[in-house]
Interface confidence: low
């Protein structure tokens, strides 16, 4: 393995991810790692000198850039919120605020808009499909022995509480939109009316 800076015949460096061809000196030089930028360009005798990106800037990849990219905050006006802050080697990670979903352009989430979601009524739940879609939700009734008591796009039907497991007895049966109500069993020897 050659150590930069080194001369090369065909202008193709050995490790193209971490090295680049510097035509001024006709040598292969080191790129700077993520989070750094070129502080001093290489020469025939000295390799690239890198330095950490200044505060509020970043470079995500191995590079021979003489600047770092300026960190951009997640744009609240466009409906984004910050998941992870900008660091010297990555830009801020943004996602849509709760209740909003992405509008994509060329595979990039350019802004967020309020979700126009179908709310599944109590007693129903959103049908689970392979496609992860936030729109065109199909609501289906809870299966027997299950209930769902909210108006929600994402709530799932839950199994009814089984009173006997808790040493209780059923006071009122569960429905598709309400849970079973349990009560303490009668005292032994108590008169049954």
């Amino acid at each position: 393995q050659l150590v930069p800076p080194y001369r090369i015949e065909n202008q193709t460096c050995w490790d193209q991810d971490k090295e680049y061809y510097e035509p001024m000196h006709d040598v292969c030089c080191s790129r700077c790692p993520p989070g750094e930028f070129v502080f001093a360009v290489c020469s025939r005798s000295q390799d690239t000198v890198c330095k950490t990106c200044p505060h509020n800037s970043y470079n995500e990849h191995w590079n021979h850039l003489s600047t770092c990219q300026l960190c951009r905050p997640c744009d609240i006006v466009l409906g984004f919120e910050e998941v992870a802050p900008c660091t010297s080697d990555r830009k801020a990670e943004c996602r849509c605020q709760p209740g909003m979903s992405c509008v994509y352009l060329d595979n990039e989430c350019v802004h967020c808009e309020e979700e126009r979601l179908v709310l599944c009524q109590p007693g129903t739940e959103a049908e689970v499909t392979d496609e992860i879609m936030d729109t065109d939700v199909n609501c289906v009734p809870c299966k027997p022995g299950h209930f769902q008591n909210t108006s929600s796009p994402r709530a799932r039907c839950q199994p009814h509480t089984r009173c006997e497991i808790q040493g209780l007895v059923e006071a009122a049966p569960g429905t598709s939109y309400s849970d079973t109500i349990c009560k303490n069993p009668p005292e032994p020897g108590a008169m049954l009316l």
């Epitope: 070129v38 502080f39 390799d47 200044p54 505060h55 003489s66 600047t67």
Partner: antibody, heavy 120, light 113 residues
Framework: QVQLVQSGAEVKKPGSSVKVSCKAS????????ISWVRQAPGQGLEWMGG????????NYAQKFQGRVTITADKSTSTAYMELSSLRSEDTAVYYC?????????????WGQGTTVTVSS | DIVMTQSPDSLAVSLGERATINCKSS????????????LAWYQQKPGQPPKLLIY???TRESGVPDRFSGSGSGTDFTLTISSLQAEDVAVYYC?????????FGQGTKVEIK
């Protein structure tokens, strides 16, 4: 050859503000951090803050935070340092300086200095 | 911020003799990625702005006489004037540029004995 030319001496009253300019010539202005360093009479060098015109963001020494504002006008290749709420201990020579390598390296170009006197 | 401490505060040396100035940083200014020390030395004469002498702790600025040399690594650095000349009377400062908040030592005044 890079040259940094600063504005002339100032006499100011306590509580007022002063704005010192530093005009750069003979180099790429935007690509280098311009630093401001001051020196009180008989004292050492004290870094106040700096600005990288290409980014437009300034950073300041903790001591001067909130009292100093450093700006840069790329169209005229001029950097400015404004110090507010002046007191007598701000009497000093104020220098602008910049590196010859990209961004924020050793300072090899210095302005001639601007004397600011704060006196009632 | 990184604190730079110089010693001594002042130094009187005979013409032609060696002058040694020390500088200590509160944290290392050696950058492991490139094995370089982000430390510079400046000379300042009365009524003049500082002049760069040394960068990368030991690299002489072009035009600086070779009687000036810098050494050290990590947190401990030295500026040596091997044979003091009359024109070397000045205040000398070390400075780190490891962080974007530059800091300077308090200065060492070099005089002729």
């Amino acid at each position: 050859q890079v040259q940094l030319v600063q504005s002339g001496a100032e006499v100011k009253k306590p509580g007022s503000s002063v704005k010192v300019s530093c005009k750069a010539s003979g180099g790429t202005f935007s690509s280098y951090a311009i630093s401001w360093v001051r020196q009180a009479p008989g004292q050492g060098l004290e870094w106040m803050g700096g600005i990288i015109p290409i980014f437009g963001t300034a950073n300041y020494a903790q001591k001067f935070q909130g009292r100093v504002t450093i700006t840069a006008d790329k169209s005229t290749s001029t950097a400015y340092m404004e110090l507010s709420s002046l007191r007598s201990e701000d009497t000093a020579v104020y220098y602008c300086a910049r590196p010859s390598y990209y961004l924020d390296g050793w300072l090899d170009y210095w302005g001639q200095g601007t004397t600011v006197t704060v006196s009632s | 911020d990184i604190v730079m401490t110089q010693s001594p505060d002042s130094l009187a040396v005979s013409l032609g003799e060696r002058a040694t100035i020390n500088c200590k940083s509160s944290q290392s200014v050696l950058y492991s990625s490139n094995n370089k020390n982000y430390l510079a030395w400046y000379q300042q004469k009365p009524g003049q702005p500082p002049k760069l002498l040394i960068y990368w702790a030991s690299t002489r600025e072009s035009g600086v006489p070779d009687r000036f040399s810098g050494s050290g690594s990590g947190t401990d650095f030295t500026l040596t004037i091997s044979s003091l000349q009359a024109e070397d009377v000045a205040v000398y400062y070390c400075s780190q540029y490891y962080t974007t908040h530059y800091t300077f030592g308090q200065g060492t005044k070099v005089e002729i004995k």
